[in-house]
């Protein structure tokens, strides 16, 4: 898909650049996993709306495709979810982040991962030392990824006899027990996969490919970018202002994103002795809904009001807190008289055009 030139916003100065950022993160997920992609805005400035694009087509949020601030989650992933994902600024199509995602059949088994590389013809007639079959895929020697992402190093090779592959970390033999969460060695894929990387995974990773005729090696450097812990993020526009007819049902929604376990509460602003705030400036509120023994986060993200009365009108707040801090969004409920009264008003003096 050709996007032509586009404006890249860098420190508020526009420059013309190509359609893809230089960093393309390669991620592997297992079938049934949740694909999670994160894309914080460069410079942290206001970017306007964003859109996630897969293989050139815009992704619409659904039950399975969840979108939050700078974040995409695809639940219960399957082969069809493999592809090129980018997070773009909606208005200009500026590519903020780019990911290459592969969803494999058997995430836990070492040698039965299928895909395009399975078809590589690694059979060699003449005896000889190992050689790289896809050197163009090994250009990216420095990989910088956010913590909790999946990293995959590959060294596709061939030789006769078929060479073996082993891995070193910082020059020493690297095995699964050397890291929490272990590693996945996929010999047929000539790959090393580490899920949920942490800062201690930083270092130099070397693949050693050898047979009796010789040995070749390639070193990759991994940098793990620590997530800056933050208070919960609440989805823009939620909860939304609502207008309801007397006696009807209303739902307020609040979408919370938080690395640390969030605690969600729904509050209603009330007046005490004619005042909305206390002597210290804190608003008077009543807690309508909070976490209980049997309440799920999903249930807490919705506040349902049944058979609303005029007393229900007012300001409602979704308050979310975690170990780092609190965030809150508010919305107003306007309660209108029942429909019959409105019809009379309409007939009395409404002019319709269009």
């Amino acid at each position: 898909e050709s996007l032509g030139t586009e404006q890249r916003v860098v420190g508020r100065v526009a420059e013309v650049s190509g359609p893809e950022p230089s960093q393309q993160e390669q991620l592997v997920f297992g079938s049934g996993d949740a694909v999670e992609l994160s894309c914080p805005p460069p410079g942290g400035g206001p970017m306007g709306p964003t859109v996630w694009v897969k293989d050139g087509a815009g992704l619409v949020p659904s039950e399975r495709v969840l979108v939050g601030p700078q974040r995409l989650q695809v639940l219960n992933a399957s082969h069809e979810d493999s592809g090129a994902y980018s997070c773009r600024q909606r208005l200009t199509q500026l590519v903020l982040c780019h990911f290459s995602v592969r969803v494999t059949d058997a995430p836990s088994s070492g040698d039965d991962e299928d895909g395009e590389d399975e078809a590589e013809d690694t059979g060699v007639d003449t005896a000889g030392a190992p050689y790289w079959t896809r050197p163009e895929r090994m250009d990216k020697k420095l990989l910088a990824v956010p913590a909790a992402n999946t990293v995959r190093f590959r060294c596709p090779a061939a030789g006769n006899p078929t060479p073996s592959i082993s891995w070193l970390k910082n020059g020493k033999e690297f095995r699964g027990e050397h890291r929490i969460g272990g590693i996945k060695l996929r010999h047929q894929q000539w790959s090393l996969v580490m899920e949920s990387v942490v800062p201690s995974d930083r270092g130099n990773y070397t693949c050693v490919v050898e047979n009796k005729f010789g040995s070749i090696r390639q070193t990759y450097t991994l940098d793990v970018l620590e997530r800056s812990p933050h208070r919960p993020i609440l989805q823009a526009g939620l909860p939304a202002n609502q207008t309801a007819v007397l006696g009807s049902d209303v739902e307020f929604h609040c979408k919370v994103y938080s690395d640390a376990q969030p605690h969600i509460q729904w509050l209603k602003h009330v007046e005490v002795n004619g005042s909305k705030v206390g002597p210290d400036g804190t608003p008077y509120v009543t807690v309508l809904k909070t976490a209980g023994a049997n309440t799920t986060d999903k249930e807490l993200e919705v506040l349902s009001l049944h058979n609303v009365t005029f007393e229900d009108a007012g300001e409602y707040t979704c308050l979310a807190g975690n170990s780092i801090g609190f965030s809150h969004h508010s919305a107003w409920l306007v309660v209108l008289p029942a429909e019959e009264e409105l019809v009379e008003a309409d007939e009395a003096g409404s002019v319709y055009a269009g």
Partner: antibody, heavy 121, light 110 residues
Framework: EVQLLESGGGLVQPGGSLRLSCAAS????????MSWVRQAPGKGLEWVSG????????YYADSVKGRFTISRDNSKNTLYLQMNSLRAEDTAVYYC??????????????WGQGTLVTVSS | QSVLTQPPSASGTPGQRVTISCSGS????????VSWYQQLPGTAPKLLIY???KRPSGVPDRFSGSKSGTSASLAISGLRSEDEADYYC???????????FGGGTKLTVL
Amino acid sequence: EVQLLESGGGLVQPGGSLRLSCAASGFTFSSYDMSWVRQAPGKGLEWVSGIYSGDGSIYYADSVKGRFTISRDNSKNTLYLQMNSLRAEDTAVYYCAKDGPMNEESRFDYWGQGTLVTVSS
Amino acid sequence: QSVLTQPPSASGTPGQRVTISCSGSSSNIGNNYVSWYQQLPGTAPKLLIYADSKRPSGVPDRFSGSKSGTSASLAISGLRSEDEADYYCASWDYSLSGYVFGGGTKLTVL
């Protein structure tokens, strides 16, 4: 053929409420960003609010923040604008506008014919 | 007072080339795309140009858009009587977190 048909306009007193609807057809409504744009009599265009499918975000012009609420019902292919605490300066023709595809640069490529909202006592 | 500044009027004779300017700032035109709309009397606006200079299908190539820094221009060559209309520029504004329109330019074909 893309069609956008606004309704719900009319005469309302200052402080009153109105709900505008925009019935969409001829395209996959849920996949497109939508906006409301208004035009006061004899004046220029003013963007009012936009609702973005790609990230669920909603934006409002400062002049209507806290009073107007944009929403959509994808099952009914309908865009709404709930207008509360209406003022005389909200008097305008309100247009519903469709944005271009999500994977292309933003622009209002289709517009409805508009519905007139008159706020007067 | 509009965030984007356009001349209130412009005029030309049939066959002439007319240019309409639109001036903004780094928070809108300088860091975002500009689109142009034509509004014939008594009708809804119609998209003429988007992404600074792209033309939707069906728009004659007599209409062209350009941009430099924080200013954009709409050029109409081979002016025709049916081009008599109001023309508006628009862009997203980062500091306002919303779209902004120019005040509009009334084009008269003499």
